[in-house]
Structure formats: structure tokens, C-alpha cells
């Protein structure tokens, strides 16, 4: 089938188009939604910084890249992108910075080619467990998603539901095992205090995992063993104090891994000895020469690679009779 040989980029400026859940009218080949800019040659629609409150209904069938950034969408309902005929080509969807606070179950259903989804910089107080899987079945149809970008989606403290934010996000990632094919997952800048222990084991295809700029204190209960394809693990700017032997061994056992550990408050006491030994031998840590101690005070700014066992002591624990109040 032959497409038109020419297609003008369209810069529309009429009132925002309010969407219903499903658009039954087949889109005209060259039409462009109001307040959007379209290029059929680039298979791209950009509806950027337009204060749209709903997803336009009249998206052109050719759209492969859809930018809906900088809007005021608030809620993404079930079937927000469902159309008749479906948007069969849509592969990359960017919804970042669009003031989304709720993403409902099945919001991304009927997008058979969706490979990359960016929901970053939205205060997601309510992310349905079935946002990505589309159904509450124990095993859902596999999602086509390959990249899921969820940086800075933590809502302000006063807008959070009365539940664990980490748990809400992980429930959406694991529901129905739909994201088994996910290769890139970005969860930076989300104030995560911990990583639920089962999350990584159920995402076996991961190549890139970004957990930077969170508040992770420990990886003790996190297993990387099954992530045999993992190529990059970003843990910069967390609250990590030390990595223990089990974690070190698992990371060392991953064949393609590069780990980023900058700007963590490493505690350089006797518990750090194994990590220092490992750092001196391993090639997997990028910029390992930049890692420095934060505590105790006497060790502040010391380079981890320059430490030896004599530097890494723990204050003796006094028996109760000798402790002072």
C-alpha cells in the first residue's frame, strides 16, 4: 500500500480536543489534532506544553512517536489510547511532565507495538497495579514494552496514598508477569527507601536498571542473580553504606555488568573490608577511584581504593557493665 508522497507538518491552534475513551471514527490520513504538530514523514505527533486535559481522539493512524509532554492530563483512564482502528504503529509514547496523578488499569491497552513509555515527572499518587498489564489475571498477555521510564514519579508527601509508594510501583511492574520482555527500567529520583526483594527476579530480560538518586540504604535482600543480561546498574546518589559479600558476588557473576556507585555515604569501618577488597579487584564498577568514605568522621573523603584493612576498624562494643549512659 502506498502512502501519500507529501505531508505538511501541521501547526494547529484551535481549542483543546477533548477525548472520549474510544474513538470510533477512522482518522483521516493527513489530519492533525488541534494544538499538535504532526509530521507524517517522521511518523511523529507532538502535543507539547499545550495544557491538554485529555488525550486527543483524532490521532493519525501513522503515528509512531507520540509526545504528550507538559500537559495537564491528571487522569489516564482505561483505553486512553484505544482507537478504531487501533494505533497499530505507536511505538514510543512520552507523557512526561503532564501532571498525571492517576493511571488506571488498562490505560495502555490496544497499543500492540508500544515499545517505549515515559511517565517521568508526573506525581503518580495512584498507579494501578494493572496499568501496564491491562488485566487482573495472574498471568497476563505479554506487554510489548521494552523500555519503561519512571523517573521522578513520586508524589508530594501530602498527596501519597496511605501505602508504600515502592510497593505500589512494584505491584504495577510485576502484575500478571506482563513485563517479562522489559529491557530498560528507569526509577531514578523516587525517594525509594528499599527495593522489594522479588522485583528483579521477575524482570529477567533487564539490560539497564536506573535506581539513581533514591534513598536506598541497603541491597542486602535484593538478588541480582537472575539478571544475566544486565549491562548497567545505576545506584549513584543513594544512601548506601556498604555492599555485603552476597551482593558483591552476585554482581561479579553478571557477565556484562557495569555498576555506578558514585555519591553514596559509604561507612568505612570493619564491615567495609570485603567491599574494599572487591573494589580493588573488580572491573565492573565504573569510576571506582571516585568512591570516598562519608563516615566515620575521621575517614571522611578517604578514597576507598586507597584503604587497607588496618584503616577499617570498628569501635569495640563494651560489655553492659562498662557502658556509660
Amino acid at each position: 500500500s502506498s502512502s501519500p508522497t507529501s505531508s505538511a507538518s501541521s501547526f494547529s491552534s484551535s481549542a483543546p480536543f477533548l477525548a472520549s475513551a474510544v474513538s470510533a471514527q477512522p482518522p483521516l490520513p493527513d489530519q492533525c489534532p488541534a494544538l499538535c504538530e504532526c509530521s507524517e514523514a517522521a511518523r511523529t505527533v507532538k502535543c507539547v506544553n499545550r495544557n491538554l486535559t485529555e488525550v486527543p481522539t483524532d490521532l493519525p493512524a501513522y503515528v509512531r512517536n507520540l509526545f504528550l509532554t507538559g500537559n495537564q492530563l491528571a487522569v489516564l483512564p482505561a483505553g486512553a489510547f484505544a482507537r478504531r482502528p487501533p494505533l497499530a504503529e505507536l511505538a514510543a509514547l512520552n507523557l512526561s511532565g503532564s501532571r498525571l496523578d492517576e493511571v488506571r488499569a488498562g490505560a495502555f491497552e490496544h497499543l500492540p507495538s508500544l515499545r517505549q513509555l515515559d511517565l517521568s515527572h508526573n506525581p503518580l499518587a495512584d498507579l494501578s497495579p494493572f496499568a501496564f498489564s491491562g488485566s487482573n489475571a495472574s498471568v497476563s498477555a505479554p506487554s510489548p514494552l521494552v523500555e519503561l521510564i519512571l523517573n521522578h514519579i513520586v508524589p508530594p508527601e501530602d498527596e501519597r496514598q496511605n501505602r508504600s509508594f515502592e510497593g505500589m510501583v512494584v505491584a504495577a511492574l510485576l502484575a500478571g508477569r506482563a513485563l517479562q520482555g522489559l529491557r530498560r527500567l528507569e526509577l531514578a529520583s523516587n525517594h525509594f527507601l528499599y527495593l522489594p526483594r522479588d522485583v528483579l527476579a521477575q524482570l529477567p530480560s533487564l539490560r539497564h536498571l536506573d535506581l539513581s538518586n533514591n534513598s536506598l540504604v541497603s541491597l542486602t535482600y535484593v538478588s541480582f542473580r537472575n539478571l544475566t543480561h544486565l549491562e548497567s546498574l545505576h545506584l549513584e546518589d543513594n544512601a548506601l553504606k556498604v555492599l555485603h559479600n552476597g551482593t558483591l558476588a552476585e554482581l561479579q557473576g553478571l557477565p556484562h555488568i557495569r555498576v555506578f556507585l558514585d555519591n553514596n555515604p559509604w561507612v568505612c569501618d570493619c564491615h567495609m573490608a570485603d567491599m574494599v577488597t572487591w573494589l580493588k579487584e573488580t572491573e565492573v564498577v565504573q569510576g571506582k577511584d571516585r568512591l570516598t568514605c562519608a563516615y566515620p568522621e575521621k575517614m571522611r573523603n578517604r578514597v576507598l581504593l586507597e584503604l587497607n584493612s588496618a584503616d577499617l576498624d570498628c569501635d569495640p562494643i563494651l560489655p553492659p557493665s562498662l557502658q556509660t549512659s
Epitope: E37, S39, K46, R115, V146
Partner: antibody, heavy 122, light 107 residues
Framework: QVQLQQWGAGLLKPSETLSLTCAVY????????WTWIRQPPGKGLEWIGE???????NYNPSLKSRVTISVDTSKNQFSLKLSSVTAADTAVYYC????????????????WGQGTTVTVSS | EIVLTQSPATLSLSPGERATLSCRAS??????LAWYQQKPGQAPRLLIY???NRATGIPARFSGSGSGTDFTLTISSLEPEDFAVYYC?????????FGGGTKVEIK
């Protein structure tokens, strides 16, 4: 890493049909838009046309009446046919792919064949 | 069709100098513009896509800027291997079009 290898007749007589084929190795065939471009001796680049994974084609209006681009997905190949050639069609012909991966915003032709010199002469 | 006009046609510079190449479109192409480098006897090589993004493996001395109708390719400090012909190309509208090229030659 995707690579392209192209071949076809290099010497044609006026009124004959130019026929070139480009084979895709080492990557997703469906994740690209496949393009033909030519470059007359000492001149700049001219886009001939392209075909996508659903076999939808777009051609340069200046050549549209003479050009056909097709794909053979079973062989990971795509082809160019240009009918009724004249001396003005003498050029180096390149096959190329754009849209680095299916799910990345990517608007440059990042994979190119080695080029085939086609001379039209009686 | 969208006409891309590159200037200057030729740029004579010495290694280490800064090169600034211009590409002007006859109508807006948004950010759907790429830059290519071509050396004699070789296929073009993608340098910049989407007006300002460096392609994989391209050195940081190459940078692109602009949106709409005016675009610039900058080479911050010319290396000997950078002397070549540079083309801009738009993907906003069919037919896809290339600029006429700028030749960067050794002074």
C-alpha cells in the same frame, strides 16, 4: 550491529531498467525504514524513496513514475528498480536505513550500504 | 518540497580551529534535521539527529543546534580527520531533501 550490503548491475544502456538489491545483516529488519539515495558524480545527495516494514512506500515526485522499491522480508532484503534510465541517472546509489531502533525517536539514516556506481552510457 | 540551503559552500580552516556550518530550511522542519559527514569514496556517516543529538560513536566536538528553519553544526576544534563534506537533511516532509553540502577544507 546492523550492516547493509548492496549489489546490482553497474553499466546500463539508455532505456534499460536499473536494478539494485540491499541485504540487511545483524539486526531487526522491521525496526527500520529502508531508503535509497543517489549521488551524481561531483554532486550532492538525492533521496529516491523509502519503504517501511508494512511495505508502505514513498517516492521522490521527480522520479515517482519510474521507481519501484520493494522488500523481501523472508530474505531481509529490499530492492530498487528504476526504469527507462538515461545518462542523467548516472550516480553512486546507496541503500540506507533510518530510525535506529523501533522504540527510539530517531530521524537520521544511521546505517548505509557501501554504494554502487551505476553508469548509463550507450 | 522543502529546500535546504547550506552556507558557506566552502570553509577553509586549520586544524584546531572552530567550524560553524549553517543550514536554512525554506519552511519549518521542527527538529527533524540530521547532519552527515562524507569523505571521498565513502558513504555518508550520520553525525547528528533530531537537530542536536549526537549519533552513537560521534565525538563530543561535534554539536548541533537549532529548530524550525535555522540550524547549525559546530565542530569545536577541527581534527585532521574532520576535513570532509557535510550535508544537512530534513525528515519533516516528503520528499526528504538534503542541503547542497559544505566542504570543510584545510587552509
Amino acid at each position: 550491529q546492523v550492516q547493509l550490503q548492496q549489489w546490482g548491475a553497474g553499466l546500463l544502456k539508455p532505456s534499460e531498467t536499473l536494478s539494485l538489491t540491499c541485504a540487511v545483516y545483524g539486526g531487526s529488519f522491521s525496526g527500520y525504514y529502508w531508503t535509497w539515495i543517489r549521488q551524481p558524480p561531483g554532486k550532492g545527495l538525492e533521496w529516491i524513496g523509502e519503504i517501511d516494514h508494512s511495505e508502505s512506500t514513498n517516492y521522490n515526485p521527480s522520479l515517482k513514475s519510474r521507481v519501484t522499491i520493494s522488500v523481501d522480508t523472508s530474505k531481509n532484503q529490499f530492492s530498487l528498480k528504476l526504469s527507462s534510465v538515461t545518462a542523467a541517472d548516472t550516480a553512486v546509489y546507496y541503500c540506507a536505513g533510518w530510525f535506529g531502533e523501533l522504540y527510539h525517536y530517531y530521524y537520521g539514516m544511521d546505517v548505509w550500504g557501501q554504494g554502487t556506481t551505476v553508469t548509463v552510457s550507450s | 518540497e522543502i529546500v535546504l540551503t547550506q552556507s558557506p559552500a566552502t570553509l577553509s580552516l586549520s586544524p584546531g580551529e572552530r567550524a560553524t556550518l549553517s543550514c536554512r530550511a525554506s519552511q519549518s522542519v521542527s527538529s527533524y534535521l540530521a547532519w552527515y559527514q562524507q569523505k571521498p569514496g565513502q558513504a555518508p556517516r550520520l553525525l547528528i539527529y533530531d537537530a542536536s543529538n549526537r549519533a552513537t560513536g560521534i565525538p563530543a566536538r561535534f554539536s548541533g543546534s537549532g529548530s524550525g528553519t535555522d540550524f547549525t553544526l559546530t565542530i569545536s576544534s577541527l581534527e585532521p580527520e574532520d576535513f570532509a563534506v557535510y550535508y544537512c537533511q530534513q525528515r519533516s516532509n516528503w520528499p526528504l531533501t538534503f542541503g547542497g553540502g559544505t566542504k570543510v577544507e584545510i587552509k
